[in-house]
Amino acid sequence: NQDLPVIKCVLINHKNNDSSVGKSSSYPMVSESPEDLGCALRPQSSGTVYEAAAVEVDVSASITLQVLVDAPGNISCLWVFKHSSLNCQPHFDLQNRGVVSMVILKMTETQAGEYLLFIQSEATNYTILFTVSIRNTLLYTLRRPYFRKMENQDALVCISESVPEPIVEWVLCDSQGESCKEESPAVVKKEEKVLHELFGTDIRCCARNELGRECTRLFTIDLNQTPQTTLPQLFLKVGEPLWIRCKAVHVNHGFGLTWELENKALEEGNYFEMSTYSTNRTMIRILFAFVSSVARNDTGYYTCSSSKHPSQSALVTIVEKGFINATNSSEDYEIDQYEEFCFSVRFKAYPQIRCTWTFSRKSFPCEQKGLDNGYSISKFCNHKHQPGEYIFHAENDDAQFTKMFTLNIRRKPQVLAEASASQASCFSDGYPLPSWTWKKCSDKSPNCTEEITEGVWNRKANRKVFGQWVSSSTLNMSEAIKGFLVKCCAYNSLGTSCETILLNSPGPFPFIQDNIS
């Protein structure tokens, strides 16, 4: 056994933007610190077989499987994956160890499996086995964080029951309105689960893992703001925790806060108060209303009252399951070629939706903005004046919603023509859909004014390219028009376009485009 080399197997995770298949090399990329895969001798195996710890990789991630061999003399090697041999180029590091690497870029299902590395040194032969699998992200979840009161402490714990374990952070802001946007200098982030400083203006908790980032805002009523005439609304699902913070600042401590639900005081275990003096010696009080697990009968108007400030209310609505409310009837728009235009969907939803806009099988990011009437809006302006069918899709944990839009761009027809031995066809995608005329050019009618009505077959919208209609007109050849020039014209309210076709000429058909406005 003393002849066996000392070997080390490591996994290197890369942050990369390349896409490629497995490469046997020391491929240069930005990398994380190597993870020891602890290559151990496999018992009861014929020959010397080392087995590395199983490697789980995210889809599209890039990794390097690396073996460091501490053995005298030269080594040669061969990688085998799914019965295919892959080139192997060992090199030596500064400590004179043999280094063999397999780079897997942009991990896919086809790259998962067993990677065998055969090494031959002057002293011995041995095999190293790596098992690479794609991490099952189907089991991954990212749940919106919720709040709990810390036992025996005036503090909130932020919890997100997610897989893999998320990083939880508090996002705090002490100024009003716009300056509390995520990247504003007024925003402070604290990467911890427990928060003791609960007096700030805006308090959110966010959880993030491989699936993204979800945030929950601590619903707050500020009694120092003049009450809105319309009451804010908070949706919750049965079983979720309710947290409402009522905050008031006054010149001295001579004021108190109370919570009522539908004009009845909240029960003792459903609220707790905190107070502090601010820098200018004014008193800040906050009173939390909370229910650890809401039921339908917790629905109603919650009112926070102060002995000095105008009271304020919020409507808490408890629903059995999440919803997305919006009108799903399809909408058609026609716009001019340079007209500014955005699609928009107005919806009310709980929990918050994830959404996409799709056109021509391409998905576009979807932004949503809360309106001040309880609805949200998503707009899509990046259509680049391409006519066709646009799809808005939204979903949350409990509901799905799809809405179709058709965009028509008003423009003059453009005519394309093709001909065969038996017929001539013209196509146009102008909008509004054009009407067609066919004219014969002859000695009698050098200006092509003689209209052809026989043998004409118009097809409106014979093919739909992602919602874009194309109109066509076909002229069946008859003896009367063989050998003549004919003209097909498409016209709509924006203009006319024509093509002239010489019928029955040998070889490719000459087409003469003739645009008439």
């Epitope: 003049t226 809105q228 319309t230 609304q233 400030h309 309880g374």
Partner: antibody, heavy 118, light 111 residues
Framework: QVQLVQSGAEVKKPGASVKVSCKAS????????MHWVRQAPGQRLEWMGF????????KYNEKFKGRVTITRDTSASTAYMELSSLRSEDTAVYYC???????????WGQGTTVTVSS | DIVMTQSPDSLAVSLGERATINCRAS??????????VHWYQQKPGQPPKLLIY???NLESGVPDRFSGSGSGTDFTLTISSLQAEDVAVYYC?????????FGGGTKVEIK
């Protein structure tokens, strides 16, 4: 009990100003936003604006912007509404009314008649 | 501005009978889960008195023969059994949007 007592009737010439007072009692003055509403003969009630006595926030109906000013004196638990550049169509009964967010205008003053006549 | 249209302008009902007053808003007066419409009663020489708030909630101290219903743009005030003291003008009001606006009033009399 809650009471809003307004100042007496006024007769004014066109172009003049009028200031109507509304004294609150029976509750903490700063705890309720105070609104002003007027009712001209044969016309519907018309909202003029409000003041939050706690923080002195005001909001006015665009129709009266620049002509109406609502103020308050917390030590006297009194709200005031001043209307300037009076014209004959400002002849009306002017009311102060206490507003609660969950409810609406739940208590009203008795009204002050303002007559604008040359 | 949101226009509140009441109908009928006047209504004569026998004592003990039901009186129904309608109010239509020129656009929805619902926000979040609430309808921001309120009903007032005004007797001659008196200020208005709040009867119903947020479309259907009875103000404390108001007899339960008064009730309100509706959402969106259409609202109704019902007096289930008219009493002599109910003779007055009734107004609807919205505060979903500024400026707050009132209906033109419905005069209720005894037949």
């Amino acid at each position: 009990q809650v009471q809003l007592v307004q100042s007496g009737a006024e007769v004014k010439k066109p172009g003049a100003s009028v200031k109507v007072s509304c004294k609150a009692s029976g509750y903490t003055f700063t705890r309720y936003v105070m609104h002003w509403v007027r009712q001209a003969p044969g016309q519907r009630l018309e909202w003029m604006g409000f003041i939050n006595p706690y923080n002195d926030d005001t909001k006015y109906n665009e129709k009266f912007k620049g002509r109406v000013t609502i103020t308050r004196d917390t030590s006297a638990s009194t709200a005031y509404m001043e209307l300037s550049s009076l014209r004959s169509e400002d002849t009306a009964v002017y009311y102060c009314a206490r507003w609660r967010q969950l409810g609406s205008l739940d208590s009203w003053g008795q009204g002050t008649t303002v007559t604008v006549s040359s | 501005d949101i226009v509140m249209t009441q109908s009928p302008d006047s209504l004569a009902v026998s004592l003990g009978e039901r009186a129904t007053i309608n109010c239509r808003a020129s656009e929805s007066v619902d926000t979040y889960g609430s309808s921001f419409v309120h009903w007032y009663q005004q007797k001659p020489g008196q200020p208005p008195k709040l009867l119903i708030y947020l479309a259907s909630n009875l103000e404390s101290g108001v007899p339960d023969r008064f009730s309100g219903s509706g959402s969106g743009t259409d609202f109704t005030l019902t007096i289930s059994s008219l009493q002599a003291e109910d003779v007055a003008v009734y107004y609807c009001q919205q505060n979903n949007e500024e400026p707050w606006t009132f209906g033109g009033g419905t005069k209720v009399e005894i037949k």
